[in-house]
Interface confidence: low
């Protein structure tokens, strides 16, 4: 069956709702599970054979304000004598996040949802090699 | 980032920390990304610490839909096409924030949640603890 | 916005010295490595000298190496060239280039942000 | 003397496809990932390639690389007026432990 967007629900509306103007929705950014911990084994971004670095990214008018952002270290992967074997690739795995995005309108001020694509860490791939005919 | 300047005419209310509850536009900027990462690249299978996708779906989140990776093996591929063991497959896991409807099942109320995803996998070296 | 901004070039006579600057704004300078990159008239691109993102690693063109010094201030957000020993084939633009990606790199993702070059003219 | 050897010239038509070859040694291309660059009279450079076949935002999917061994090539497809500029390779070299540039190739848009 179709899966529900935002906005739209193939649930029975409760009465409980709150009343929300049209095109627009109520969003309470007190996040649940604020305080969890990733528990990712130590250091895997040293240690991998596609090893990234971390940027952290700060927009005082996006919550949160602060998103970090990994980058491959090497194009190729990092093999068992510690060098770059360029026959192999270091490539970047996404995911996507929501922020909240503060927009200034003249003296108004407006909230917007944006979907941001987050680089989490990288992974060594077998490269696609593309024969010419 | 930047902080844009206001109007001097404004009255002067700006809050450098953002509301608990704001009211947002419906429409969701880069909405239209592709979400299914089976379809947005395959290095789920070309890496050396491959992983299966798995689809968990939740009506009373936005996306409704989130892939959890899976790795494979313990260890890595190696050039062989063999698993090595002297290598650990782990998963990369972030924090990402989703919409969950509350009260539950209301069509135009949310609140923000963080959910931990693994996203994919890399193949490390392992930590060895020697024993003394 | 990305930018970076040379100054400290001129006419200098044969054997002195001059020392380039260029002004980093826009992104976390300390994570990037920098470059430095000239051209002399009516020539082609020659690399003259790197530096790693927290200054501990540097490296060197053979035509420059002894004289010229790569360098930088993190918490000025600016890179500098110290030219010592200048002569007549050391006349070029000079331009300072950013590394495309942050940490331990010095070339995998490209020089992605260049200056608009600074002018070094040798001369009696 | 330049480590990496590219040709003086290179020209088409509009919309034709030129190619601009980059050759090296085993120091350098074939042991490193080979970036391009673009610069038009008067202004710098702009990285136009890195990596294998990467491209920074901005750049069309006109422009592709190729390498292989100890040389590489940059194919510019669809030509227009505006590719006319000079084009460079670069990348690593482990034998002179720096940067290094090729000498460089124009690019003329015929008629």
């Known amino acids: 069956r179709k899966i529900p967007k935002v906005g739209h629900t193939f649930f029975q509306k409760p009465e409980s709702c709150p009343p929300v103007p049209g095109g627009s929705m109520k969003l309470d950014i007190g996040i649940i599970n604020e305080n969890q911990r990733v528990s990712m084994s130590r250091n895997i971004e040293s240690r991998s054979t596609s090893p990234w670095n971390y940027t952290v990214t700060w927009d005082p008018n996006r919550y949160p304000s602060e998103v970090v952002q990994a980058q491959c270290r090497n194009l190729g992967c990092i093999n068992a004598q510690g060098k770059e074997d360029i026959s192999m690739n270091s490539v970047p795995i996404q995911q996507e996040t929501l922020v909240v995005r503060r927009k200034h309108q003249g003296c108004s001020v407006s909230f917007q949802l944006e979907k941001v694509l987050v680089t989490v860490g990288c992974t060594c791939v077998t490269p696609v090699i593309h024969h010419v005919q | 980032g930047i902080t844009i300047p206001r109007n001097p005419g404004c009255p002067n209310s700006e809050d450098k920390n953002f509301p608990r509850t704001v009211m947002v536009n419906l429409n969701i900027h880069n909405r239209n990304t592709n979400t299914n990462p089976k379809r947005s690249s395959d290095y789920y299978n070309r890496s050396t610490s491959p992983w299966n996708l798995h689809r968990n779906e939740d009506p009373e989140r936005y996306p409704s839909v989130i892939w959890e990776a899976k790795c494979r093996h313990l260890g890595c591929i190696n050039a062989d096409g063999n698993v090595d063991y002297h290598m650990n497959s782990v998963p990369i896991q972030q924090e990402i924030l989703v919409l969950r409807r509350e009260p539950p099942h209301c069509p135009n109320s949310f609140r923000l949640e963080k959910i931990l995803v693994s996203v994919g996998c890399t193949c490390v070296t392992p930590i060895v603890h020697h024993v003394a | 916005e990305v930018q970076l901004l040379e100054s400290g070039g001129g006419v200098v006579q044969p054997g002195r010295s001059l020392r380039l600057s260029c002004a980093a704004s826009?992104?976390?300078?300390?994570?990037?490595?920098m470059h430095w990159v000239r051209q002399a008239p009516g020539k082609g691109l020659e690399w003259v000298a790197v530096i790693s993102y927290d200054g501990s690693n540097k490296y060197y063109a053979d035509s420059v190496k002894g004289r010229f010094t790569i360098s930088r201030d993190n918490s000025k957000n600016t890179l500098y060239l110290e030219m010592n020993s200048l002569r007549p084939e050391d006349t070029a633009v000079y331009y300072c280039a950013k590394v495309g990606a942050s940490g331990d790199y010095y070339y995998s993702y490209g020089l992605d942000v260049w200056g608009q070059g600074t002018t070094v003219t040798v001369s009696s | 003397q330049s480590g990496l050897t590219q040709p003086p010239s290179a020209s088409g038509t509009p919309g034709q496809t030129v190619s601009i070859s980059c050759s090296g040694s085993n120091s350098n291309i074939g042991s490193h990932s080979v970036n391009w660059y673009q610069q038009v009279p008067g202004a710098a450079p702009k990285l136009l390639m890195y990596?294998?076949?990467q491209r920074p935002s901005g750049v069309p999917d006109r422009f592709s690389v190729s390498q292989s061994g100890t040389s590489a090539s940059l194919a510019i497809s669809g030509l227009q007026s505006e590719d006319e500029a000079d084009y460079y390779c670069a990348t690593w070299d482990d034998s002179l432990g720096g940067y290094v540039f090729g000498s460089g190739t124009k690019v003329t848009v015929l008629g």
């Open positions: 990596g294998i076949g």
């Open positions: 826009g992104f976390i300078f300390s994570n990037y490595g």
